[in-house]
Interface confidence: low
């Protein structure tokens, strides 16, 4: 069965799934897609790495943690109700038959009130879109509402404290991380 | 196999104007950022401009800013620079170079073989 | 903007000499460092991305190293097709910048 995540409507969810590579900058190609996992590759891709790098996205479907380090957890911008359903997270070790997959659930709930931006620093708050003119530079970060503003290494801090404590739990109830190597 | 290929080049007077053209195969340019580097004769390298996967944001140099426009036409896997207002100092090799969507992994994998614009009365 | 200062502007080396070549940014650019060679009417050719990852197909005496705002590219033993100009560039923030360039010629 599927591990089960909520989001309101009008924040940010966050899926995670990780790997640890063999070595350093030794990545493994990655994609999520909407739907469950298929036999081969993932259906409806939403975001794709290759061996280097983040090489395919779509609108609201960030990378926001280290995923040179094999934090490949999505984060879905300012959801909808549309966006409930399964994601697969879709791990494609080299070899036959080898990919890891994982189907994550994502429950919409529908807001209580008008979502307005927030201060709290939890799962939705911690990993804004970061928004400038083209890159993703601190020194051009804007946050979308009035989020805290959040460099690229506060949010990998912020990764590592949120997977070393609440998201660890997840994980290894959830078994959504594997070691390659 | 991965190329880019500029076209467009050529000689015109101050406050010309010229179209260039980086024709990509290989790869599906809605995917990836392209840049447009210029080197002027015996100098080094300098970045022009660059538009993202879904033609979304474009970005320039201070130098060009209000000059030169950007633009995508992924039908056709092609990137274009429209250069209005040329200077002297614009005179250089024009290169195109394919970048990936986060900037902080945005260095430049493949470059096209350049095309010389040459500014000159 | 961003400045990258490249140092030196160029050297006169030997094949089988160890080379270093060293860039400093004038702020902080976490590792969103690449280092390209280019050779005379050639584009330029990516080698070194995000300060120290080798790039696909480049040999393994290049390499690539950061010290906070300090990056340098080792070349560990110079061969006769490395003779060639080195740039480095910032890709943290727009503009991306390079630096001036390193030309390595034959000693």
């Known amino acids: 069965s599927e591990v089960e995540y909520r989001a309101e409507v009008g924040q940010n969810a966050y899926l995670p799934c990780f790997y640890t590579p063999a070595a350093p900058g030794n990545l493994v190609p990655v994609c999520w897609g909407k739907g469950a996992c298929p036999v081969f590759e993932c259906g409806n891709v939403v975001l794709r790495t290759d061996e280097r790098d983040v090489n395919y996205w779509t609108s609201r479907y960030w990378l926001n943690g280290d995923f040179r380090k094999g934090d490949v957890s999505l984060t879905i911008e300012n959801v909808t109700l549309a966006d409930s359903g399964i994601y697969c997270c879709r791990i494609q070790i080299p070899g036959i038959m080898n990919d890891e997959k994982f189907n994550l659930k994502l429950v919409i709930k529908p807001a209580k009130v008008t979502p307005a931006p927030t201060r709290q620093r939890d799962f939705t708050a911690a990993f804004p879109r970061m928004l400038t003119t083209r890159g993703h530079g601190p020194a051009e970060t804007q946050t979308l509402g009035s989020l805290p503003d959040i460099n690229l290494t506060q949010i990998s801090t912020l990764a590592n404290e949120l997977r070393d404590s609440r998201l660890a739990n997840d994980l290894r109830d959830s078994g959504a991380t594997i070691r390659i190597g | 196999e991965v190329q880019l290929v500029e076209s467009g080049g050529g000689l015109v007077r101050p406050g010309g104007s010229l179209r260039l053209s980086c024709a990509a195969s290989?790869?599906?340019?809605?995917?990836?950022?392209i840049h447009w580097v210029r080197q002027a004769p015996g100098k080094g390298l300098e970045w022009v401009a660059d538009?993202?996967?879904?033609?979304?944001?474009?970005d320039y140099a201070d130098s060009v800013k209000g000059r030169f426009t950007i633009s995508a036409d992924t039908s056709k896997n092609t990137a274009y620079l429209q250069m209005n207002s040329l200077r002297a100092e614009d005179t250089a090799v024009y290169y195109c170079?394919?970048?990936?969507?986060?900037?902080?992994?945005?260095?430049?994998?493949?470059w096209g073989q350049g095309t010389l614009v040459t500014v000159s009365s | 903007d961003i400045q990258m200062t490249q140092s030196p502007s160029s050297l006169s080396a030997s094949v089988g000499d160890r080379v270093t070549i060293t860039c400093r940014a004038s702020?902080?650019?976490?590792?969103?460092v690449a280092w390209y060679q280019q050779k005379p009417g050639k584009a330029p050719k990516l080698l070194i991305y995000?300060?120290?990852f080798l790039y696909s197909g480049v040999p393994s005496r290049f390499s690539g190293s950061r010290s906070g705002t300090d990056f340098t590219l080792t070349i560990s033993s110079l061969q006769p097709e490395d003779f060639a100009t080195y740039y480095c560039?910032?890709?943290?923030?727009?503009?991306?910048?390079f630096g001036q360039g390193t030309k390595v010629e034959i000693k």
């Open positions: 170079a394919r970048g990936y969507v986060y900037r902080m992994w945005d260095s430049f994998d493949y």
């Open positions: 290989g790869f599906n340019i809605s995917n990836y950022a």
């Open positions: 538009i993202t996967p879904d033609g979304g944001y474009t």
């Open positions: 702020q902080d650019v976490n590792t969103a």
């Open positions: 995000s300060a120290s």
């Open positions: 560039q910032q890709h943290y923030t727009t503009p991306p910048t």
